[in-house]
Amino acid sequence: MSSKYPRSVRRCLPLWALTLEAALILLFYFFTHYDASLEDQKGLVASYQVGQDLTVMAAIGLGFLTSSFRRHSWSSVAFNLFMLALGVQWAILLDGFLSQFPSGKVVITLFSIRLATMSALSVLISVDAVLGKVNLAQLVVMVLVEVTALGNLRMVISNIFNTDYHMNMMHIYVFAAYFGLSVAWCLPKPLPEGTEDKDQTATIPSLSAMLGALFLWMFWPSFNSALLRSPIERKNAVFNTYYAVAVSVVTAISGSSLAHPQGKISKTYVHSAVLAGGVAVGTSCHLIPSPWLAMVLGLVAGLISVGGAKYLPGCCNRVLGIPHSSIMGYNFSLLGLLGEIIYIVLLVLDTVGAGNGMIGFQVLLSIGELSLAIVIALMSGLLTGLLLNLKIWKAPHEAKYFDDQVFWKFPHLAVGF
């Protein structure tokens, strides 16, 4: 007969998720209200469009990007949506509590929804390393811990290093990558006999993963510019991100062909590498003074991404138990670091140009921020991994990793596997 959730999880998941949702509703009831001061309705529409772009990136882009497994595509898309919906709610409250609460109620604006969507995106990046090996109850825990850790990281960085919204949110790439990798490291690693086929990619899901990559590619300029403060900064960010992702597409496809003995193009490389430029340019997208620099950065990022996709999966599979097609984690970790290094280079160049003696101090601050982001990601990721290993969550048995049938009702299937 077809496989079902174990009885205990069938009781635990709805109870856990609905209790949490009820708690969130109560928190919203007591502690939040809308910003009532908006005068300009046209401004509202323009502001909403940015948030809409971010939601499309999260729900469709990252949802489908992670759906390339042969027998785990439904779960990838739907679980992403579930995590996004939960993550946004908690992120809005958390950001409000951390930044506004002493002054009374949390004021909800379109900007706070934007911030919350970006915080939830962090979870969707991280989860790529563990999707297929965890159930929804475990994912709820992951969402809560990661959003909380990122929110606190952003607050600490903002207060200690005096970093603005854009700069402290751009640590998301490195944070999400290291968080996901450290969670994966804690989970049972060896794929048992008989499941090797399930973590392979198939044509239809791979096509939907490519669709996800295309949506991310289209909207990455919105992501990189969403939190910037002035039109000129947003314009620079949009242009530079666009040039960087355009070049990384060309690099990804040609680099993938170059990396294959028969000159064939790998779907997995392309899914991930097309986004490389957007990640690498993120931190400094509003500061890069001319298009050619963004394009060079896109080229380098594309090459690093393809190189990483070729040589790192073996290591990641052995050490972390991450399947070959889930390369977002190490990809974003490398490219996020590249982006941070580019920012430090710009910092040094600018400071030298100004003939100022503050170089060491500024560089130290930037390295401090980055180190803090990595440390908090690793620590909170390990904590999450340990929590997910608790028996209470009734994790899927290793023989049922990467399998939609464990979670979904398929009426046309008479029997299981």
């Epitope: 002035s230 039109p231 900064e233």
Partner: antibody, heavy 125, light 107 residues
């Protein structure tokens, strides 16, 4: 020519409300962040609030947080300051100021390049 | 960051070289601006980014410094320069603050 013109000031009793307006001309209003700065009689300048170019973000000085609300209507080229629960210490000349920027090192630096002439608010019983 | 200006008032003569200092309670890099205000008038921007002269401002005004110590220098005082001068930091993107002001008077 860039112009900022404040209005709405006057005498008001403690605990009451007042709404200041700042109508601008001579530049594209929706490209700039805007600020309110005040100056109590015989005292120095005190920053009050800022609103981003698209109205998406607002910050306030601790002394006015929860009582004052900054807003803008880009279609009317107008900046507002809604002042509730006014106190005697809110008595001041209120200036609106345009925020401009320069790219410096690896960040943008902001400064106030144009100011209005100010409107006097007197809170007295 | 708190800003402290010194001196709080200063008497000088036309033609004098005058220096006003502004000290920040923590490092603010070069995120410091200087304004001039005459009685009954709105403030006017003189210097931004610690040392950049605003267009239309006479070249006798200059700014320097970074980190915590900044100076505004008027190389040769003119009659129209007698006013109150304020420093202002924009390092903290949530909080802008001004110094308490330096009143420059005719000796």
């Amino acid at each position: 020519e860039v112009q900022l013109l404040e209005s709405g000031g006057g005498v008001v009793q403690p605990g009451r409300s007042l709404r200041l307006s700042c109508v601008v001309s001579g530049f594209t209003f929706n490209n700039y962040g805007m600020h309110w700065v005040r100056q109590a009689p015989g005292k120095g300048l005190e920053w009050v609030a800022v609103i981003w170019f698209d109205g998406s973000n607002k910050y306030y000085a601790d002394s006015v947080k929860g009582r004052f609300t900054i807003s803008r209507d880009n279609s009317k080229n107008t900046l507002y300051l809604q002042m509730n629960s006014l106190r005697a210490e809110d008595t001041a000349v209120y200036y609106c100021a345009r925020e401009n920027q320069i790219k410096l090192w690896s960040r943008y630096l902001y400064y106030f390049d144009y100011w209005g002439q100010g409107t006097l608010v007197t809170v007295s019983s | 960051a708190e800003l402290t200006q010194s001196p709080s008032s200063l008497s000088a003569s036309v033609g004098d070289r005058v220096t006003i200092t502004c000290r920040a309670s923590q490092s603010i890099s070069s995120y410091l601006n200087w304004y001039q205000q005459k009685p009954g008038k709105a403030p006017k921007l003189l210097i931004y980014a610690a040392s950049s002269l605003q267009s239309g401002v006479p070249s006798r005004f200059s700014g320097s410094g970074s980190g915590t110590d900044f100076t505004l220098t008027i190389s040769s005082l003119q009659p129209e320069d007698f006013a109150t001068y304020y420093c202002q930091q924009s390092y903290s993107f949530r909080r802008y603050s001004f110094g308490q002001g330096t009143k420059l008077e005719i000796k």
